[in-house]
């Protein structure tokens, strides 16, 4: 799989889940989040080429048709397959809420 | 939706469905089906900036970044999103088979 | 230049329900909060509740919870305001405000206002 | 919740005098968490003051606001024709915000 685990000790160029740390405040503009003040959110990058981590049938398509003509634009990309929640704690005046993101931290990537 | 509704009838610069037709033999040196020759596969193309189809609060995280960080290269990739099946007829020696190929042709892309 | 502009003021009978729209443009919609507040004929201030659009977490006046929802839609910078149950004491002008960045803050850009009208 | 209670209900002096409004919490509020509001007829509200004393952006200096605690002050250093407005505060400290009842300044 295309996850932290591998991507992170690995120097593979095709696609795989790459490390982005973001910053709340700096990167988003986000004031209302109070912790943490930014997050390892991640990212997916890099070629898909045939056999690599398709996840359709039609991705597998793609690449096979891209492997036969190879200057075409029409290519699978590398995004993300599973991606975790995120924990904050926000205020609202005084008072900490704690709240669940839902899908904020990618941790493997397919070629769709 | 970005589906080829829209996408074929507008000249749509960022994340729209395209016309790619995709010929078996040719394109994929496949000689194992016989009817189509070839189908209307379509491909997801276009930059995905902000506020653009998201598909997740991932996606919407990502490219408010890129917004702030326009020289990154984490962004959101435009993908399928919904595909549908292709009838295709081959042959077991000199008996016609027909199957239905799941996933082969993209209706309508995403960002992700 | 930032602007908020509110719609769907009507005049509604009461027991009915009313969905408002506020559509945002001139700054990053989804990095602020965006709260409603509405003011009765010739009356004061009341704030209703405020939300985060990218996350869609609202927060309710307790006054009003189970009675108005807010919700937004990053996609085209707007956020809606929806009231049911609507009693005559409801007839304000509604203004939708862009926040200082917090949940809870000072409201630092404010659309026209809507007017709801709660009559038999 | 948090009762803001303004005094006075309404005042009226002459141009180029010193306005002063006042601001009572029924709780403490901190030193930030209070704001200025300036609205006139048919219009939506104007922030001024934010954070108890911080001038909004394009804010006259002229306006100003101060204290800490259940106790805030607003003033006008030297009132102008197109100052005629109500004058709301507003905390921010708890849920849900609320607004004093608002002054009504006029021009003598």
């Known amino acids: 799989a295309l996850d932290t685990n591998y991507c992170f000790s690995s120097t593979e160029k095709n696609c795989c889940v790459r490390q982005l740390y973001i910053d709340f405040r700096k990167d988003l503009g986000w004031k209302w989040i109070h912790e943490p003040k930014g997050y390892h959110a991640n990212f997916c990058l890099g070629p898909c080429p045939y056999i690599w981590s398709l996840d359709t049938q039609y991705s597998k398509v793609l690449a096979l048709y891209n492997q036969h003509n190879p200057g075409a634009s029409a290519a699978p990309c590398c995004v993300p397959q599973a991606l975790e929640p995120l924990p904050i704690v926000y205020y609202v005046g005084r008072k900490p809420k704690v709240e669940q993101l839902s899908n904020m931290i990618v941790r493997s990537c397919k070629c769709s | 939706a970005l589906d080829t509704n829209y996408c074929f009838s507008s000249t749509e610069k960022n994340c729209c469905v395209r016309q790619l037709y995709i010929d078996f033999r040719k394109d994929l040196g496949w000689k194992w089906i016989h009817e189509p020759k070839g189908y209307h596969a379509n491909f997801c193309l276009g930059p995905c900036p902000y506020i653009w189809s998201l598909d997740t609060q991932y996606s919407k995280v990502l490219a408010l970044y890129n917004q702030h960080n326009p020289g990154a290269s984490a962004a959101p990739c435009c993908v399928p999103q919904a595909l549908e099946p292709l009838p295709i007829v081959y042959y077991v020696g000199r008996k016609p088979k027909v199957e239905q190929l799941s996933n082969m042709i993209v209706r309508s892309c995403k960002c992700s | 230049e930032v602007q908020l502009v509110e719609s769907g003021g009507d005049l509604v009978k009461p027991g009915g329900s009313l969905r408002l729209s506020c559509v945002a443009s001139?700054?990053?919609?989804?990095?602020?909060?965006i709260s409603w507040v509405r003011q009765a004929p010739g009356q004061g201030l009341e704030w209703m509740g405020g939300v985060i659009p990218i996350v869609d977490i609202a927060n309710y006046a307790q006054r009003f919870k189970g009675r108005v929802t807010l919700t937004a839609d990053t996609s085209t910078n707007t956020v809606y305001m929806e009231l049911s149950n609507l009693r005559t004491e409801d007839t304000a002008v509604y203004y939708c405000?862009?926040?200082?960045?917090?949940?809870?803050?000072?409201?630092?850009?404010w659309g026209q206002g809507t007017l709801v009208t709660v009559s038999s | 919740e948090i009762v803001m209670t303004q005094s006075p209900a309404s005042l009226s002096l002459s141009q180029e005098e010193k306005v002063t409004i006042t601001c009572r919490a029924s709780?403490?509020?901190?030193?930030?968490?209070l704001a200025w509001y300036q609205q006139k007829p048919g219009q939506a509200p104007k922030l001024l003051i934010y954070g108890a004393s911080s001038r909004a952006p394009g804010v006259p200096s002229r306006f100003s606001g101060s204290g800490s605690g259940t106790d805030f002050s607003f003033t006008i250093s030297s009132l102008e024709p197109e100052d005629v407005a109500v004058y709301y505060c507003?905390?921010?400290?708890?849920?849900?915000?609320?607004f004093g009842q608002g002054t009504k300044l006029e021009i003598k």
């Open positions: 405000a862009r926040t200082l960045g917090l949940v809870l803050d000072a409201m630092d850009y």
């Open positions: 709780q403490s509020l901190g030193s930030s968490y």
């Open positions: 001139g700054f990053t919609f989804s990095s602020n909060v």
């Open positions: 507003q905390q921010y400290a708890d849920s849900p915000i609320t």
